[in-house]
Every structure is written in C-alpha cells, then in structure tokens.
C-alpha cells in the first residue's frame, strides 16, 4: 500500500557532545516492522543508519556514524521511528533524509540538523 513519509518541518537542534533525535513516521500509520527504514546524509547519500529484515545493518553505515547511532523502534509497529545520534559533532550538521521502503515502494522526507556550541556566548553589551 502507498504511504507518505513525514519528518520535522523545522530544524532539529543539538549541542556538540549531546544527543540528537530525528523523528520520522509514515502516514497513514501502519506497521513498518517488515519495511526497510533508514537515514542518509543529503546530498551525499552516505548511510547514517539502516534497518532491514528486522535488524539494524551496522556494516552498511558510513564510518563516521559507526557506534554513534540508535534507531528507536518501540513504536515501529505504528510506523513511527526516531534516529538518535550520540556524541554529536559539528560535522553532523546539515541535511538528512529518512526513508521507508515497502517492497518496491519507497517514500522519503528531508530534515535538517543544526549543531550548536554549548560554550558559545554572546556578550549582550
């Protein structure tokens, strides 16, 4: 069946060293356990995280994300997932694309991550 993929229409903000959470869902909501779900960096198409055949495909990740991502899957049966990026770096800032693939049918949604310096302070004077 057909569906749409929905991501945040606003930038997700995270501090360097903290976690970033990038939510994504399909509409109308349906069980996505059997689907392929993933995130890649746009426009470079580097794999950030991939879930296929009911498992995270760690070997397919770009090296700079290896060991730093987690797919929150507790609500995948409702078509809702979140990518958590740990120990956020300045280089993580930019565009991401989330996709859901059901057999040959695929839809995706773009989103943006803004990374901020927790120690940056502007003198109000």
């Amino acid at each position: 069946g057909q569906f749409r993929v929905i991501g945040p229409g606003y930038p997700i903000r995270a501090l360097v060293g903290d976690e970033a959470e990038l939510p994504c869902r399909i509409s109308p909501g349906k069980n996505a356990t059997g689907m392929e779900v993933g995130w890649y960096r746009s426009p470079f198409s580097r794999v950030v995280h991939l879930y296929r055949n009911g498992k995270d495909q760690d070997a397919e990740q770009a090296p700079e994300y290896r060991g730093r991502t987690e797919l929150l899957k507790e609500t995948i049966s409702e078509g809702k997932v979140t990518l958590r990026i740990q120990n956020v770096r300045f280089s993580d800032e930019g565009g991401y694309t989330c996709f859901f693939r059901d057999h040959s049918y695929q839809e995706e949604a773009a989103m943006e991550l803004k990374v901020e310096d927790p120690f940056y302070w502007v003198n109000p004077g």
């Epitope: 991501g7 945040p8 959470e21 939510p23 109308p28």
Partner: antibody, heavy 119, light 107 residues
Framework: QVQLVESGGGLVQPGGSLRLSCAAS????????MNWVRQAPGKGLEWVSA????????YYADSVKGRFTISRDNSKNTLYLQMNSLRAEDTAVYYC????????????WGQGTLVTVSS | DIQLTQSPSSLSASVGDRVTITCRAS??????LAWYQQKPGKAPKLLIY???SLESGVPSRFSGSGSGTDFTLTISSLQPEDFATYYC?????????FGQGTKVDIK
Amino acid sequence: QVQLVESGGGLVQPGGSLRLSCAASGFAFRNYAMNWVRQAPGKGLEWVSAISGSGGSTYYADSVKGRFTISRDNSKNTLYLQMNSLRAEDTAVYYCARDYGGISPFDYWGQGTLVTVSS
Amino acid sequence: DIQLTQSPSSLSASVGDRVTITCRASQGISSALAWYQQKPGKAPKLLIYDASSLESGVPSRFSGSGSGTDFTLTISSLQPEDFATYYCQQFNSYPHTFGQGTKVDIK
C-alpha cells in the same frame, strides 16, 4: 491504556509561582514528545510549550518565554511545567498532551488542571 | 509564526445537515494539520490528522481535505453528539498553533 493526569493547579497571586505535573502511564513515555496547552475561560486553545522525548529540546510560545520552564523525568514518567512571574492572563485550564517527535498531532490529552492568577 | 484562521467562527445547523469548516494557514504547512472536537468541560479529541487521515474510532461522517494553506473539515450528516467546538492545529513547525475555533450549535 494511555493515561495523562495533570495536577498542581490552584489559586496564586500575580507574580507568584506554581509547578504543574502530568503523570503518564500506558505507553513508552520516553519515546514521545510532550506538550502543555492552555485554555482561558471561554476562550480557545493556546499551545504553550513542548519538550522532546529525551528532554534535550524545548520550545515555548512567545507569551510564556522566559517565565515558564518545561521539563520531564523519564524515570518517573512525569512531565512538569514550572510557571514563574504569573500574570492574570495566565489564568486557564492547562492540559498536557502527547505527540510523536513534534511531527504528529496530539492524540492523547489529560483532563486539565485549572490555574487561577488573582489577588 | 504560522497563523491559522478558521471560518466561520460559529454556525447553526440541524441534525442531518452537511457542515463544512475551513482553516487557512498564513504560510504553507504541507499536510501537517489536525482537527479536534471539544465539548464543554472536556479535553479536545483528535478527529483528523495529516489533513485527511481519520483517527481510529472516529465516525466516517468526519472527513478532512486540503494541503498547503487551505484545509476543510466536513461533517457529512450532523448528529446530535456533534454539536461542539472544532479547532484546527498545525504541527509543521513550532509554535504548534491552533485556529480560533468554530462553534457548531443547534439551529
């Protein structure tokens, strides 16, 4: 089943403070963003504040920015709203509501708690 | 901030009538719009999400349409329990604003 129960409302003088709580049950609390929405007597709904599932991101309406603080304790499945420098115009029923990641509608709401700011 | 303007602000109708409420966004919000029903003294109840998807358990007489800036909630045949206030809400970006509401009462 999903349940959201607000508490902490009451009568407070202008300039005073109050902390609202919202106890959640029946779902994986840490996976959901949470919101506070208020409704002044006889008026419409006004979104007040939101917090991400991890608590790392917070958002506020301009009308409460700098005065209200949203927080959550995922170990206690509880959402909070610390309200300082209260004004008469903050008088309202305050509802907590859940959504998924800030990208979904509010599918479950609490019953509301009344905050009255008056001298 | 995105403003939502509902029209009409109130309407009188009879049981069996077809009722249409519109919601206009001040800028495009794709399909990130929901409709809620609220009865006096109660919390709002989600009816429609993503502009046109019917929430589970909501009667099929409720339907939604639209995308971008113009949205519509339709009640195909008004029932006695449908007399209430209806709100639209956008969740495309923060702040997640609501429309001012449309009160549907008995003619």
